[in-house]
Amino acid sequence: SEGRKTWRRRGQQPPPPPRTEAAPAAGQPVESFPLDFTAVEGNMDSFMAQVKSLAQSLYPCSAQQLNEDLRLHLLLNTSVTCNDGSPAGYYLKESRGSRRWLLFLEGGWYCFNRENCDSRYDTMRRLMSSRDWPRTRTGTGILSSQPEENPYWWNANMVFIPYCSSDVWSGASSKSEKNEYAFMGALIIQEVVRELLGRGLSGAKVLLLAGSAAGGTGVLLNVDRVAEQLEKLGYPAIQVRGLADSGWFLDNKQYRHTDCVDTITCAPTEAIRRGIRYWNGVVPERCRRQFQEGEEWNCFFGYKVYPTLRCPVFVVQWLFDEAQLTVDNVHLTGQPVQEGLRLYIQNLGRELRHTLKDVPASFAPACLSHEIIIRSHWTDVQVKGTSLPRALHCWDRSLHDSHKASKTPLKGCPVHLVDSCPWPHCNPSCPTVRDQFTGQEMNVAQFLMHMGFDMQTVAQPQGLEPSELLGMLSNGS
């Protein structure tokens, strides 16, 4: 029917914008479209340098730089709450000239029974209550309004949604006589979107729902629901996309099985299975239909929920994610790594890489780390010579490019970037590791030896001598 939103499978482009767009209000800058780079493809670096130089020279003229902070707004609908019944909320920094909105979901694990929720309440209360939230937050990484720190979307409207529901953004139950805690993660997102519509989101062209760790999983669980909500509220033209950072977990076999006692040693499948019941968790409808009743926990795992999603989603995941290793009971303490553990770690990277093979928009460096997109130095890591902001820019272009009915990637603008080398930090652009005792930065070779990887074993599959490999790694190749 006329005006009905047509949801797109990931990797497909949105319909071209209508020819007659409403004229911007007087004094409002026109939102720019991605540039057509075809004419300058050969000399892209020099062109980008000129654009950056121009942006930086114009930047001091704007009022944007006067206040870097995002300001706290507690929800007006106080029935949508954090775990302890205090109102949920969001931090906002408006960018009036932009029709791009970035909504970021914070991470911070979860709790799945009264005991570990009580303990969390007495240790990490800011993740369960808004009572002590600061009035402002500084935007970092992808939430920064500085073009130097955020070359991707520095001019967007920035929204940081604090995580205070402990339910991987999936819960839909309120506090009551029976329930000591409210778990309203899914409802918090819906309510934030509803309130933002009155603050300018109604005029948005693109809404990017992003998140890290539990927030990254929250993106996968909520992105289609946000798109459906906007459509139902009469905003079918807002393109909803997802950016899931460090939230793509595997329900693999733990290195050492432990009983489900606390949050970080409980096998993820068991923790989520218990959590869903405790939180009254909701999962994407299309995914839920693929599994039997009681098996909804499957939808918390990226590789299972992703094929059911309609909105385009970009997946960012370290191949050796620290949270994944933690729930798998792998604890790297600098003691020599036994062969069984080394093979387990390498296999984890291989399995994760395999789950991303059909994810057209992905960035997966072979590093041992956790979370990236709101780190100040999120621009530093590269996969196959491409940084994450650049890959996201290419993703934007691929979604905007209306003649992209063919699946061929844009020339010189890759979006599927998954490291193929097989061990932690084999990518020389990985975040630096420091030696615990000296505080000195370690290069990749030092790090691998520090972890107990035998250089002979590491070099052999590459068809190299240990000395050759050490030389290559020390040179950052």
Partner: antibody, heavy 119, light 111 residues
Framework: EVQLVESGGGLVKPGGSLKLSCAAS????????MHWFRQAPEKGLEWVAY????????YYADTVKGRFTISRDNAKNTLSLQMTSLRSEDTAMYYC????????????WGTGTTVTVSS | DIVLTQSPASLAVSLGQRATISCRAS??????????MHWYQQKPGQPPKLLIY???NLESGVPARFSGSGSGTDFTLNIHPVEEEDAATYYC?????????FGSGTKLEIK
Amino acid sequence: EVQLVESGGGLVKPGGSLKLSCAASGFTFSDYGMHWFRQAPEKGLEWVAYISSGSRTVYYADTVKGRFTISRDNAKNTLSLQMTSLRSEDTAMYYCARKHYNGGYFDVWGTGTTVTVSS
Amino acid sequence: DIVLTQSPASLAVSLGQRATISCRASKIVSTSGYSYMHWYQQKPGQPPKLLIYLASNLESGVPARFSGSGSGTDFTLNIHPVEEEDAATYYCQHSRELPPTFGSGTKLEIK
């Protein structure tokens, strides 16, 4: 002034019982999870027990489970540790401590009360 | 339980020099930008005193010569310049899960 003061320590025979108390003042007691720790002579710090801010959840170290009971009275701003079936290895200085709810560190400690288990 | 390995067990530092104490956890104690590791000072006959919380935050009233750093599993307490009154035993403690555990302590002696 924010303060914790322990009392109730003393000399007791093996198999005997003792009840320690910790009086809190200068802060909203009901907002904080509370812990008991102990330190044997010339030894390090050992965690003993925890009670959540609302008393719903309690945890014990394996070494005291089934013998010690932690409780609190938020109306009276007091924390207690009932110790039974005492052993010589329970001899230590016992401290109560306030756990900060945004970090889980112990920012306020009592001065301690000595428990000696000896025949 | 998370085991905290503190090193060295004791150290002697000259007045005005730097003292560095390390603490390694058997599991990652950081999440969502916070590292749940803390440092305490204890003098004979006194209860422990909080110095540094959440890896790097100085407790109010603690001199700025104390600083903490680290994330994941590896953490460090630095004291610089060391003063006479810093002679004490220092403990690290995590609060990532129950039970909270402490390192075995580092005894600092001033030369």
